[in-house]
């Protein structure tokens, strides 16, 4: 932190020492408490980190995340015949990403225009709620997917309606849980006018009363309950999965599955290392430093970590790719600008010419393919 006359910089949810209690007018009406922004805070709010770096990253996330997750959701809902538990979890993962990413144009505009929020209090709260909601939804659905992948290897039994219903029930429970845990983000006033900068910030400036105690406790609880515990479950599932795959007999098909499983594990590990661990760790450290020392020395790291956490919306499609045969086909053909139907017809035509007596493994009238679970 840059040395200043007033030591009240509070970081993102930056700032916010309220020097004294809220004022009470003669009519007994409490005037809205105002928030501390000092020289350091003002530098951050006008600096290149928030006005250049963040919008660049968010633009990349939006450009990559919106079409890839949009296509994934479409594939899982309309192009996958059997709704396996994995499909259900991935569909929810894609939906969570979409619900977060659709607001990014507002977020990008906000940062480009010097952290000036012009879209109203309600939209700011929605943006912040969805921002954190997406991160915690992603962690939980990724955990479900990881445990389910392990379960499939342990119990390679056929798809049952009961398993799909359980997956739907778990998914609904996750959405409800995330809605409940993000309520504080919707309730708290997130927009604050900063006169010196002539800007209205969204989430970047919050009152100290909220910050010091409540914010630390809030994010610590989330880090333990919605990050550490699911992370432990995910890690356990993959460790056990690797053990199982190592000990199993290897034919050509099993080798393919093993390689895909390893790629999936590496992708999820990358997501934890890039997106979830730094953001959750720094959320706790950042608010702990504010609580204990009155200022955060890790503010820049914290901003970068929170920004990188949004990259999960770009990494999730790789998970779909390694898990879903359907998504793989659609992704490959989307990149090659071909329709799946055309490819299927070509494959059918080739197959019928080569093996006229053998039945084709694909149906030309259907775009559905057998998914490997």
């Amino acid at each position: 932190t840059i040395q200043g006359t007033n030591r009240s910089s509070k970081g993102r949810s930056l700032i916010g020492k309220v020097d004294g209690t809220s004022h009470v007018t003669g009519k007994g009406v409490t005037v809205e408490t105002v928030f501390s922004v000092d020289e350091f805070s003002a530098s951050v709010l006008t600096g290149k980190l928030t006005t250049v770096f963040l919008p660049i990253v968010y633009t990349i996330v939006f450009v990559v995340g919106l079409p890839s997750n949009g296509m994934a959701l479409w594939v899982f809902l309309f192009r996958t015949k059997k709704k396996h538990p994995a499909v259900i979890y991935m569909a929810n993962l894609a939906l969570a990403d979409l619900l977060s990413v659709i607001w990014f144009p507002l977020k990008i505009a906000y940062h480009i225009h010097g952290n000036n929020w012009i879209y109203g209090e309600a939209l700011c709260n929605v943006l912040i709620g969805f921002f954190y909601g997406n991160m915690y939804c992603s962690i939980l659905f990724m955990t479900c997917l990881s445990v389910q992948r392990y379960w499939v290897i342990v119990n390679p039994m056929g798809h049952s309606r009961k398993k799909a219903n359980i997956a739907i029930g778990i998914s609904l429970a996750i959405w409800l849980l995330i809605l409940l845990v993000t309520i504080p983000l919707y309730v708290v006033k997130q927009t604050i006018f900063i006169p010196a900068l002539n800007i209205t910030t969204c989430h970047d400036v919050l009152p100290e009363q909220l910050l010091v105690g409540d914010m630390f406790n809030y994010f610590l609880s989330l880090a333990i309950g919605v990050f550490l515990f699911p992370a432990f479950l995910t890690a356990s599932a993959y460790v056990l999965m690797i053990r199982m795959l190592r000990s199993s007999a290897m034919d050509e098909n099993s080798e393919k599955k093993r390689k895909r499983a390893i790629k999936l594990i590496v992708t999820v590990l990358a997501m934890y290392l890039i997106c979830f661990t730094p953001s959750n760790l720094l959320l706790v450290v950042h608010y702990f430093l504010i609580k204990s020392q009155g200022q955060s020395h890790v503010y820049a790291l914290y901003i970068v970590a929170l920004c990188l956490s949004t990259l999960n919306s770009c990494i999730d499609p790789f998970v779909y790719y390694f898990v879903s045969h359907d998504f793989r086909d659609h992704a490959k053909n989307a990149l090659l600008c071909r329709s799946v139907r055309t490819v299927k017809q070509m494959q059918v035509s080739l197959t019928s010419k080569k093996h006229s007596r053998k039945s084709s493994s694909y149906s030309s009238s259907s775009t559905t393919v057998k998914t490997s679970y």
Epitope: V31, V34, F35, S36, V37, S43, G47, P195, N198, V205
Partner: antibody
């Protein structure tokens, strides 16, 4: 001890230009916003221009916008005010201030002794 | 622009007396108000910021209050060194504006 010393004032004809300087000492210059405030003879105070500690953002009232330019050289701990197209109503003592940003606003905490600018033909 | 109107234009006070200067903003300024003192032939100095916060080194006999559009500066136990012109300033909306000033003299 915080010190701000303005210079560059004097008599100038209308339409001409003048550049004021403010050399500071006693504090880390690049940590603070700086402002120019003027006071016409026997009159009240008028805010002229403000600049952020990095120099990246500047703020002006409509009365001087497009004519005056505030800038800073953090290496030299010096604040500048370039005044172009001067008018008789710009006649005033120009003060350089070191600001405090508290609760998101600018408060003029330390003032220089001022430099007199007289615009007259 | 936000207009700042100070009253009275001038006043005299005896030693030890308590005096009050008012400042009215043309619109609500959410407590973003400062008070400055300018002694004859000197530069102004900050007394109070954010309506009621005392600047470092300023005697505690100076106090500020108010909210919305109405603010006041109170000087209890008037001293000879308190003579001068007092200005209010709003830091809520650009352009920053000042009141016309209140001249305080010792009786």
């Amino acid at each position: 001890e915080v010190q701000l010393v303005e210079s560059g004032g004097g008599l100038v004809q209308p339409g001409r230009s003048l550049k004021l300087s403010c050399v500071v000492s006693g504090f880390t210059f690049n940590n603070y916003w700086m402002t120019w405030i003027r006071q016409a003879p026997g009159k009240g105070l008028e805010w002229v221009a403000s600049i952020t500690n990095s120099g990246g953002n500047t703020y002006y009232p409509d009365s001087v916008k497009g004519r005056f330019t505030i800038s800073r050289d953090n290496a030299k701990s010096t604040l500048y005010l370039q005044m172009n197209s001067l008018r008789s109503e710009d006649t005033a003592t120009y003060y350089c201030t070191r600001d405090r940003i508290i609760r998101g606003s600018t408060w003029f905490a330390y003032w220089g002794q001022g430099t007199l600018v007289t615009v007259s033909s | 622009d936000i207009q700042m109107t100070q009253s009275p234009h001038s006043l005299s006070a005896s030693l030890g007396e308590t005096v009050s200067i008012e400042c009215l903003a043309s619109e609500g300024i959410s407590n973003y108000l400062a008070w400055y003192q300018q002694k004859p032939g000197k530069s102004p100095q900050l007394l109070i910021y954010y309506a009621s916060s005392l600047q470092d080194g300023v005697p505690s006999r100076f106090s500020g209050s108010g909210s919305g559009t109405q603010y006041s500066l109170k000087i209890s136990n008037m001293q000879p060194e308190d003579e001068g012109v007092y200005y209010c300033h709003q830091g809520y909306k650009y352009p920053w504006t000042f009141g016309g000033g209140t001249k305080l003299e010792l009786k």
